[in-house]
C-alpha cells in the first residue's frame, strides 16, 4: 500500500486527491554527502566469485532517465583457481524501485511513479540438487 | 542497436522550471506484473555464499515510506563446509535510488527528489593483500 | 562554475597507448555520466563511448570495444580513457562531456577542452 | 549505425541574412542536438532536445523538426554566429554526428 507522509501541516487532507497530484521538485538533493559516494566502491563488478557486468537502459520519457543494469557474466561461480564451479550458481540480486514516468503528451511535464524490477549485482549460492522421487 | 524509447518535448519549456517544479501521481503504476514480481527469489539472502539480512528503514515523510535494507552476517563468505573462508570477504552491494521527500509544512504536500545509498543483497570477492613496502 | 579539464597533448607511437584524463569540478561528479567523443583533424565529431561514475559501467561504440578503456575515480572526480593499439588513424582531439543521467533531456552541456593526441613513427 | 546528413555542407551568407541548416536522419529519432564549434574551441551545446536554447544562446537561433527532419534556423544573421554546426542523434547506439556545416561570411 501507498504511505501517505505523516504531516500535521495538512489536516483533512483527502488521501486519494494528495495522491493523484502533488508538487515534486526534480532538482535532486544529495543527502549521501560526496565522501558516502566515493567510498562506494564500483570494482566489485570484477573481483566478486560472481561477477557481473553493467547495461546501459536510457528512456527518456523516465526520471531518472539512465539506469545501468546488472547482468551475471557466468551461470556458475568461479573458484579460487580462476574456474567455473559446477556446484555454484551465479545469481542475479533484483531490486524493486520507483522511478517516474512522463505522460505522453502532457505540455508542462506530468509524471505518475512506476515501479521497476532492476539488476544491481550477483551472488554465488549452492546449486539445489532436485531429488528424484 | 538499442532504441532508446521516443519522446515528444515540450516546445519553449524553460528546462530549469521544469524540473523545478513537476506535477506526479503517486499512486503505484506496476509495469512489472504480478508474475514478474512473484517469481523474484527471497532467499538468496541464506543460502548465498556471502549471507545477508534485511532490516527495515521506515520514514514518514519519505515516498516510499518503507525500504529493505541488506546487511553482510559476516565479513568473511562462507565456504561449501559451512566455515568462513579468511581469504574471502563478503561485500555489501549497494545501489542509488531516489526517493521522495517531503518538503517540512508543506501544505498540500510538496517533496523534493533525494538520492539514497541502499543495501541490496551481498557479495563474495577475493581478499587483496597489501604488499608491505 | 562547472569545468571539465584535460591533461595536456600527446605524442605516441603506432602499437602504444595513452591515457588521456578528464579532472571534472563545480558539480557533483556522480550525477552525471562522463560521454569520450573525438574529432580528428579538420574531420567531424565521433561518439566514443560513455562511463558512469557511480555504478562504473561502461558503453562503448563498437569501433572502439576493445581498444578503448573508459574508467572513473570518484575520489578526485577524474575519468579517464584510454586507448590501446594505437594507429595513425587515432591522431585527433579527444574530448570529454558530461551527461545528467536523471533527466537527458539536457544531452551533453559542458565539454572539456580537448587533448591532442598525435600517433606518429 | 544511424547516419545524420546535413545539408549544405558549407554556407556562405551576410550579416542579417536568414539561415536555415537541415539535418536528415536515416531513421526516426527522438530529439536532436545542435552544437556550435568555432576553429581550435571545443563544441558547446547549442540547441537541445531539439527546441531548446542552451543558456546563452541568443534567441534569433531556433530549432524544430521531428522524425527523420530536422532544422536549425538563425533568424538574422550576426558576426558571432559564423562557426561549423553539428547536429547529433542520442536515440541509438552507437550515438552519431552529422558531418557538420560550415557557415562563413559571403
Known amino acids: 500500500a501507498a504511505i501517505i507522509p505523516q504531516s500535521s501541516a495538512c489536516p483533512n487532507t483527502e488521501a486519494k486527491d494528495f495522491l493523484q497530484n502533488v508538487k515534486v521538485n526534480l532538482k535532486v538533493f544529495n543527502s549521501l554527502g560526496a565522501k558516502v559516494s566515493s567510498r562506494r566502491p564500483s570494482d566489485y563488478l570484477n573481483r566478486s566469485t560472481s561477477p557481473w557486468t553493467l547495461h546501459r537502459n536510457e528512456d527518456p520519457d523516465r526520471y531518472p532517465s539512465v539506469i545501468w543494469e546488472a547482468q551475471c557474466r557466468h551461470q556458475r561461480c568461479v573458484n579460487a583457481e580462476g574456474k567455473l564451479d559446477h556446484h555454484m550458481n551465479s545469481v542475479l540480486i533484483q531490486q524493486e524501485i520507483l522511478v517516474l514516468k512522463r505522460e505522453p503528451e502532457s505540455c508542462p511535464f506530468t509524471f505518475r511513479v512506476e515501479k521497476m524490477l532492476v539488476g544491481v549485482g550477483c551472488t554465488c549460492v549452492a546449486s539445489i540438487v532436485r531429488q528424484a522421487a | 542497436a538499442a532504441i532508446i524509447p521516443q519522446s515528444s518535448a515540450c516546445p519553449n519549456t524553460e528546462a530549469k522550471d521544469f524540473l523545478q517544479n513537476v506535477k506526479v501521481n503517486l499512486k503505484v503504476f506496476n509495469s512489472l506484473g504480478a508474475k514478474v514480481s512473484s517469481r523474484r527469489p527471497s532467499d538468496y539472502l541464506n543460502r548465498s555464499t556471502s549471507p545477508w539480512t534485511l532490516h527495515r528503514n521506515e520514514d514518514p515523510d519519505r515516498y516510499p515510506s518503507v525500504i529493505w535494507e541488506a546487511q553482510c552476517r559476516h565479513q568473511r563468505c562462507v565456504n561449501a563446509e559451512g566455515k568462513l573462508d579468511h581469504h574471502m570477504n563478503s561485500v555489501l552491494i549497494q545501489q542509488e535510488i531516489l526517493v521522495l521527500k517531503r518538503e517540512p509544512e508543506s501544505c498540500p504536500f510538496t517533496f523534493r527528489v533525494e538520492k539514497m545509498l541502499v543495501g541490496v543483497g551481498c557479495t563474495c570477492v577475493a581478499s587483496i593483500v597489501r604488499q608491505a613496502a | 562554475e562547472v569545468q571539465l579539464v584535460q591533461s595536456g597533448a600527446e605524442v605516441k607511437k603506432p602499437g602504444s597507448s595513452v591515457k588521456v584524463s578528464c579532472k571534472a569540478s563545480?558539480?557533483?561528479?556522480?550525477?552525471?555520466?562522463i560521454h569520450w567523443v573525438r574529432q580528428a583533424p579538420g574531420q567531424g565529431l565521433e561518439w566514443i563511448g560513455v562511463?558512469?561514475?557511480?555504478?562504473?559501467?561502461?558503453f562503448y561504440n563498437q569501433k572502439f570495444d576493445g581498444r578503448a578503456t573508459l574508467t572513473a575515480d570518484k575520489s578526485t572526480s577524474t575519468a579517464y580513457m584510454e586507448l590501446s593499439s594505437l594507429r595513425s588513424e587515432d591522431t585527433a582531439v579527444y574530448y570529454c562531456?558530461?551527461?545528467?543521467?536523471?533527466?537527458?533531456?539536457?544531452?551533453?552541456?559542458?565539454w572539456g577542452q580537448g587533448t591532442t593526441v598525435t600517433v606518429s613513427s | 549505425d544511424i547516419q545524420l546528413t546535413q545539408s549544405p555542407s558549407s554556407l556562405s551568407a551576410s550579416v542579417g541574412d536568414r539561415v536555415t541548416i537541415t539535418c536528415s536522419a536515416s531513421s526516426s529519432i527522438s530529439y536532436i542536438y545542435w552544437f556550435q564549434q568555432k576553429p581550435g574551441k571545443s563544441p558547446k551545446r547549442w540547441i537541445y532536445a531539439t527546441f531548446e536554447l542552451a543558456s546563452g544562446v541568443p534567441s534569433r537561433f531556433s530549432g524544430s523538426g521531428s522524425g527523420t527532419d530536422y532544422t536549425l534556423t538563425i533568424s538574422s544573421l550576426q558576426p558571432e554566429d559564423f562557426a561549423t554546426y553539428y547536429c547529433?542523434?542520442?536515440?541509438?547506439?552507437?550515438?552519431?554526428f552529422g558531418q557538420g556545416t560550415k557557415l562563413e561570411i559571403k
Open positions: 562531456t558530461r551527461y545528467y543521467r536523471y533527466e537527458s533531456f539536457y544531452g551533453m552541456d559542458y
Open positions: 547529433h542523434q542520442r536515440s541509438s547506439y552507437p550515438w552519431t
Open positions: 563545480g558539480y557533483t561528479f556522480t550525477d552525471y555520466e
Open positions: 562511463n558512469d561514475p557511480e555504478s562504473g559501467g561502461t
